[in-house]
Structures are given as C-alpha cells and as structure tokens.
C-alpha cells in the first residue's frame, strides 16, 4: 500500500487521542529503557508503512499483537484516513484468521510495542502541512 | 523502461503563464508519487512540487507556492504544473521526476526527465 | 524548511583517490538524506537513499554514511567517471531541500 496519500494530521490526531494511550497500557510495568529501539523510519509514509508492518504482520515470538486495542484502532485510523487502504488489506486479514494464536503478552511482544511506541513518536515529529 | 518526457516549456513574459507536462511510460504510473525539480542556469537543483499517487496530498516549495499548481491525470500517465505569475527568477530547466513510492524509497527522486527549459524574459 | 549545506563547493582530487562530501542539515533529519550525481547536460541520478543505502545499479564505491544532522558521501577510489557535482536531499518533510552541491573536480 502506497501511504503517502494518507491525512497524515488526522491519524496524528487519532495516535495522540487513543492509540499513543493504548500503547502505554500495554507497556505498563515495563521501564522505558528496557528495549532499545533498532527500527527506524525516513517521513511519515514510511514510518506508517513499518508501523503497518509491525502491528499486524506476526513474527517469531509475537503473533498476537493484531487483536490489541492499539491495533484494532490502528487499522481503523489507516482504513478512515488512508484512501484505498481496506481494499488492500482484505486478503491479509483473511490470511492472519487461520494463523491466529492464542493472546499471549510476551517479552518479545514488549521489545515489538516498544519499537511501535518510537515509529510513531517519530511519525508526529514532521511538520508535513498539506496544501 | 522508464522514461519520463517532459515539454510545454519556452519563453515566456513577466507575470505570464505556461502549463509543463511529462508524459510517463515503462511504469504503473498510478502507483508513484510524482515530484517537479527545476535547475536555473548554472545553479544547483531546486525542489518545486510533489503529488502523492492518488492526487490526496500535494506539497509546494515555499517560492512557489501560491502561483504553482501540480495535477495529475493517472488516466493518461501525465503529469502537470500550470505556473501563473511566472518571475525572472523561475528561469530554470524543469524535470520531472518519479517518487520511489516504498518505504525507504518516498520522497526520493528514481527516475528523471531530460527536462524543458523556461526562460522568464521580456 | 530544512536547509542543507554541502562542503566542500569544490573538490580537486586525482583517479583512484578517496572523495569525502559532506552534508550538513539544519535539524535532524535522520536517516533521510539521498545522494544525486550530475554531470554536464545530463539529468541528475540517484545514488544513495535513506543515508545509506546504494541504489540499483550503483557501482559499490559509492556508499553513504551519517546520522541525526551530518552526513557524508564517500568514493572509495575516483574513476574517471565519477567526476561530476553531486547534491544531497533531504527526503524527511516536505519542502524537501537539496544542498547546494560538491563539484568533483579532476587535480
């Protein structure tokens, strides 16, 4: 999916309204300092693409992450404010069905809200103004 | 292959108008970002304009802004910038060029054109 | 807007020596700076994007570097070829600026 016809201000306003608050309720109890932050993003279409990626995209040791709060309200910020975004990720959510796991929070889920919790912080630092 | 033509440039009055086009082949056009460059003679390269793939975010250098408009029609595999008011200074070789369009590639320019020249003259 | 400042203007340097160009960014804009080549009537070429990594076809002597506001570009060992001006751009918000340029010159 091409991000960069996303309102990027309007899923800065959802990040900062909900999801960022999501996020911090998943880390609870956890230092910020714990995990070092290894993945990195250029703008904001990139920043959305690795934060796609990382939210809904299982990998080894967290294959849970897609049915969390910040998730779910994650896709639906990317389905409201990025034109053509559902239509891309029917198949991929048909997909992630038959693989779903049982929700286990683990430590490698942590390090992965972790690196999350920095993409998008570094996604609400460019002044991007629309014309 | 990709090639990206440009044309619609010439000389042109102060305070004049002149529409550039760039006529994209070898790619799903649809699918790319699209970005205006321009170099005035013997200068370095200047950013104008980009549009994003489906025409939903559109961005101007500062210099321009308010004089330029940058469309796109994904039908034809054309890309455009209609440029009113046109100063001494806006003399330059414009080039389109194609946006990377995935992750670590957006905002960077892939693919130019020759470019066409505009000269801004009375 | 974010202003980019490359340095040196020109660079003398012979075959086989190793070019250092440098760009300096106004605010952090790391890791998105790409690298541009042009040469005499031709139209500027991708190099180097997001810091660091070569773009397609780049020959392996060209590699890019940097983080938070510096960033450089090295040319291992010069060919003839690569006697140009070289630009960096930043493609981290928009208006997405170009430095002024390196011109690469032969000693």
């Known amino acids: 999916y091409d991000f960069t016809n996303c309102d990027f201000e309007k899923i800065k306003a959802a990040y900062l309204s909900t999801i960022s608050k999501d996020l911090i309720t998943y880390m609870s109890g956890t230092k910020s300092t714990e995990f070092n932050n290894t993945v990195s993003c250029s703008n904001r279409p990139h920043c959305l693409t690795e934060i796609q990626s990382l939210t809904f995209n299982p990998t080894a040791g967290c294959a849970s992450l897609a049915k969390e709060m910040f998730a779910m309200k994650t896709k639906a910020a990317l389905a409201i404010w990025c034109p053509g975004y559902s239509e891309t990720q029917i198949n991929a959510t048909q997909a992630m069905k038959k693989r779903r796991k049982r929700k286990v929070t683990t430590n490698k889920c942590l390090e992965q809200v972790s690196q999350l919790q920095g993409l998008w912080r570094r996604f609400n630092r460019p002044l991007l103004k629309q014309q | 292959e990709v090639q990206l033509v440009e044309s619609g440039g010439g000389l042109v009055q102060p305070g004049g108008s002149l529409r550039l086009s760039c006529a994209a082949s070898?790619?799903?056009?649809?699918?790319?970002?699209m970005h205006w460059v321009r170099q005035a003679p013997g200068k370095g390269l200047e950013w104008v304009s980009y549009?994003?793939?489906?025409?939903?975010?559109?961005y101007y250098a500062d210099t321009v802004k308010g004089r330029f408009t940058i469309s796109r029609d994904n039908a034809k595999n054309s890309l455009y910038l209609q440029m009113n008011s046109l100063r001494a200074e806006d003399t330059a070789v414009y080039y389109c060029?194609?946006?990377?369009?995935?992750?670590?590639?957006?905002?960077?320019?892939?693919?130019w054109g020759q470019g066409t020249l505009v000269t801004v003259s009375s | 807007e974010i202003v980019l400042t490359q340095s040196p203007a020109t660079l003398s340097l012979s075959p086989g020596e190793r070019a250092t160009l440098s760009c300096k960014a106004s605010?952090?804009?790391?890791?998105?700076v790409a690298w541009y080549q042009q040469k005499p009537g031709q139209s500027p070429r991708l190099l180097i994007y997001?810091?660091?990594y070569r773009y397609t076809g780049v020959p392996a002597r060209f590699s890019g570097s940097g983080s938070g506001t510096d960033f450089t570009l090295t040319i291992s060992s010069l060919e003839p070829e690569d006697f140009a001006v070289y630009y960096c751009?930043?493609?981290?918000?928009?208006?997405?600026?170009f430095g002024q340029g390196t011109k690469l010159e032969i000693k």
């Open positions: 060029a194609r946006d990377g369009g995935s992750r670590r590639h957006y905002y960077v320019m892939d693919y």
């Open positions: 070898g790619f799903t056009f649809s699918s790319f970002g």
């Open positions: 549009i994003s793939s489906g025409s939903s975010n559109i």
């Open positions: 605010q952090d804009v790391s890791p998105a």
């Open positions: 997001s810091a660091s």
């Open positions: 751009q930043q493609h981290y918000s928009s208006p997405f600026t």
